[in-house]
């Protein structure tokens, strides 16, 4: 029967896309014999007659591209993978914005500055507000050869989480668990869309028990 | 037709600054970014900086930080690249191009550019 | 910040087939954007999403991404696609946009 062959990134259901741009949907598979994929919109077969400016399909590719997308594409796509031993389906939503996007909002005093106790654990809050799709990040200055900014003075940072969000209100929490010294320092929620970027710094001071 | 058009060759003293100009027409100026990026004579593309034609929000290179200031007026579809402290390393010509969000279910969101000025030839001679 | 690398220099028979290859660390994981650019003139998109050609760019090309290559193929190569070629990455950890080197294209003959 047909299979995904990269299931792991076909988590991302929802696409919140700007007005104008290019959407491709991918439903990569395999099988033998080799599949055969379909689309449908909305549960109907979707052929390029049925879009102004019609559709890219790449069978080698597994792929449905729509160029300069507007609102009437919005809709539920289907891929729909065959051969004679089964098929597979995947549906994605996408939603064509049609305001003008601005960059990221982050809501203001978080994440909060904190103070904790050797060993325990601590969690930061950060909500992010992006009517399209942002890359969120938690980052951690840290020092590379006893200094903080490289030979450009851009500041030495380390990621320690990154994902893009699916959803316009996200809320993130990044979790430390028993915390020593080296955890203490200055942080960064950073979220970025294709419009710019917001980021908020904050603190986490390490302690001994009193 | 889909078109940027850049302003005129400019010379220019070490120290001075140079304003290059591009215009959009044939597209809504404010659905997309515009991008600045220049080459040196027989060198390869470097990317300087874009701009949000909706807000004003910029990126800049790292390089460019401070030296470069790219802004937009959407009255006349019309984005503005800044160029200050100007060596003789900066003789290159600047092009502007439209800045196109590509979104895949995969791999996410990636920016190309995908209609480009004809390019302004900007020379730093004392 | 992502690092691109291009061979500088490509040459080819007419009618051969070109490929132009763009090296960076997991560019598999990225999409790819190629450019065109011929003497004197601006560059030209010719090739979005590692494999999307842009209309009125012909058949001939085609590209593909995987593992630390990206590669575009021109095959029958033509007099006409004597150019400059670049990748371009969008690196969305910092929001820059970060080219190769680019690779010159000579056709033989």
């Known amino acids: 029967a047909p299979y995904w062959t990269r299931p792991e990134r076909m988590d991302k259901k929802l696409l919140a896309v700007p007005a104008a741009n290019t959407v491709r949907f991918r439903c990569p598979a395999a099988g033998n014999p080799t599949p055969s994929i379909s689309w449908l919109k909305n549960g109907r077969e979707f052929r390029g007659e049925h879009r102004i400016g019609g559709i890219k399909l790449r069978h080698q590719q597994w792929s449905l591209v729509m160029e300069s997308v507007v609102p009437s594409d919005r809709g539920n796509y289907t891929c729909v993978v065959e051969n004679k031993f089964g098929s597979i389906r995947q549906t994605y939503t996408l939603d064509v914005l049609e305001r003008a996007p601005h960059r990221p909002i982050l809501q203001a005093g978080l994440p909060a500055n904190q103070t904790a106790v050797l060993g325990s654990d601590v969690e930061f809050h950060c909500k992010v507000y992006s009517d399209a799709q942002p890359h969120i990040q938690w980052l951690k200055h840290v020092e590379v050869n006893g200094s903080k900014v490289g030979p450009d003075g851009t500041p030495y940072v380390t990621v320690l989480k990154s994902w893009i969000s699916e959803s316009v209100e996200a809320d993130v929490r990044l979790r430390l668990a028993n915390v020593s010294e080296r955890d203490g320092g200055e942080y960064l929620c950073r979220a970025t869309n294709f419009i710019g970027v917001a980021e908020k710094a904050f603190w986490l001071s390490v302690h001994g028990p009193r | 037709e889909v078109q940027l058009v850049q302003s005129g060759a400019e010379v220019k003293k070490p120290g001075a600054s140079v304003k290059v100009s591009c215009k959009a027409s044939?597209?809504?100026?404010?659905?997309?970014?515009i991008s600045w990026v220049r080459q040196a004579p027989g060198q390869g593309l470097e990317w300087m900086g874009w701009?949000?034609?909706?807000?004003?929000?910029?990126n800049y290179a790292q390089k460019f930080q401070g030296r470069v200031t790219v802004t937009t007026d959407t009255s006349t579809s019309t984005a503005y690249m800044e160029l200050r402290s100007l060596r003789s390393e900066d003789t290159a010509v600047y092009y502007c191009?439209?800045?196109?969000?590509?979104?895949?279910?995969?791999?996410?969101?990636?920016?190309?550019?995908?209609?480009w000025g004809q390019g302004t030839t900007v020379t730093v001679s004392s | 910040q992502s690092v691109l690398t291009q061979p500088p220099s490509l040459s080819v028979a007419p009618g051969k087939t070109a490929t132009f290859t763009c090296g960076g660390n997991?560019?598999?994981?990225?999409?790819v954007h190629w450019y065109r650019q011929k003497p004197g003139q601006a560059p030209v998109l010719v090739m979005y999403?590692?494999?999307e050609r842009p209309s009125g760019i012909p058949e001939r090309m085609s590209g593909s991404n995987f593992g630390n290559t990206a590669t575009l193929t021109i095959t029958r190569v033509e007099a006409e696609d004597e150019a400059d070629y670049y990748c371009?990455?969008?690196?969305?950890?910092?929001?820059?946009?970060?080219f190769g080197g680019g690779t010159k294209l000579t056709v033989l003959g």
């Open positions: 701009v949000s034609t909706y807000n004003g929000d910029t």
């Open positions: 371009q990455v969008w690196d969305s950890g910092s929001d820059h946009v970060v």
């Open positions: 191009a439209r800045v196109l969000g590509y979104y895949d279910s995969i791999d996410g969101y990636y920016y190309g550019m995908d209609v």
């Open positions: 999403l590692d494999t």
């Open positions: 044939g597209y809504m100026f404010t659905s997309y970014g």
């Open positions: 997991n560019i598999g994981d990225k999409s």
